[in-house]
Amino acid sequence: APLATELRCQCLQTLQGIHLKNIQSVKVKSPGPHCAQTEVIATLKNGQKACLNPASPMVKKIIEKMLKNGKSN
């Protein structure tokens, strides 16, 4: 099932950043009824997923670049 269907938070610990070259796509989940925090989940090129800190300047830049490339939603 896609991450969008999750009915609880997925991220407890987060990374402050990650190499852009390792990222396939990024999903930004806004706070909602089932999770009060913004969650940024990167899908890596190896298929693994990682939680990124939405407040981190590096992560904000990653999201901007991925949006430009159409790899973020």
Partner: antibody, heavy 126, light 107 residues
């Protein structure tokens, strides 16, 4: 040792507020969600909500949303649960419990709450 | 909100007997179902997590099975200290929900 130690019993009047603390020790505070669960006398377990020790973001049961506030102090590894506008039905034992450990990999396989505080009896009576 | 229904409400058995406790969810919760034991005046204690995974320090006589909506806790041979109330709990989604409990009492 690994433990969650809660503050002592409280007696409150209807309409007042109560703030219960839960101090974590012996483990990595940021690797576990902290939940609050209450149990009225002779009744079952009722989930009130939880808090992320990392972001400080709290998720509340809709039933308590207007009356409950959960906060954390990372410097002392302590979590707080404040319940306002108390009524007699809020008389219960309040437990904190941890769920984890989780790292920065999202997972759909969740842990149960493997460590509980000793409980704090809150009595609401006029 | 998911509803967890436990049955039976009370189970009267003798030491040495096998106990089978049921927990049914109102909708699928994958395997994110956990079992807790509670004795009078004590906090709950986690016995089994993620349907069937064992918890350190919990005797091997406790085991769990199931998936989706139907789950079972089995105590293979009841010891005197096993007489208590047992709760199932789900955290597949929030709000987290607990069943109403099954009391295992001495026959």
């Amino acid at each position: 040792q690994v433990q969650l130690v809660q503050s002592g019993a409280e007696v409150k009047k209807p309409g007042a507020s109560v703030k219960v603390s839960c101090k974590a020790s012996g483990y990595e505070f940021t690797s576990y969600w902290i939940h609050w669960v209450r149990q009225a006398p002779g009744q079952g377990l009722e989930w009130m909500g939880n808090i992320s020790p990392n972001s400080g973001s709290a998720n509340y049961n809709e039933k308590f949303k207007s009356r409950v506030t959960m906060t954390r102090d990372t410097s002392t590894s302590t979590v707080y649960m404040e319940l306002s506008s108390l009524r007699s039905e809020d008389t219960a034992v309040y437990y904190c419990a941890r769920e984890g450990p989780y790292s920065y990999y999202p997972s759909r396989q969740y842990y149960g709450s493997d460590l509980w505080g000793q409980g704090t009896l809150v009595t609401v009576s006029s | 909100e998911i509803v967890l229904t436990q049955s039976p409400a009370t189970l009267s058995l003798s030491p040495g007997e096998r106990a089978t406790l049921s927990c049914r969810a109102s909708q699928s919760i994958s395997n994110n179902l956990h079992w807790y034991q509670q004795k009078p005046g004590q906090a709950p204690r986690l016995l089994i997590y993620y349907t069937s995974r064992s918890v350190s320090g919990i005797p091997a006589r406790f085991s769990g099975s199931g998936s989706g909506t139907d789950f079972t806790l089995t105590i293979s041979s009841l010891e005197p200290e096993d007489f208590a109330v047992y709760y199932c709990g789900q955290n597949n989604e929030w709000p987290e929900v607990f069943g109403g409990g099954t009391k295992v009492e001495i026959k």
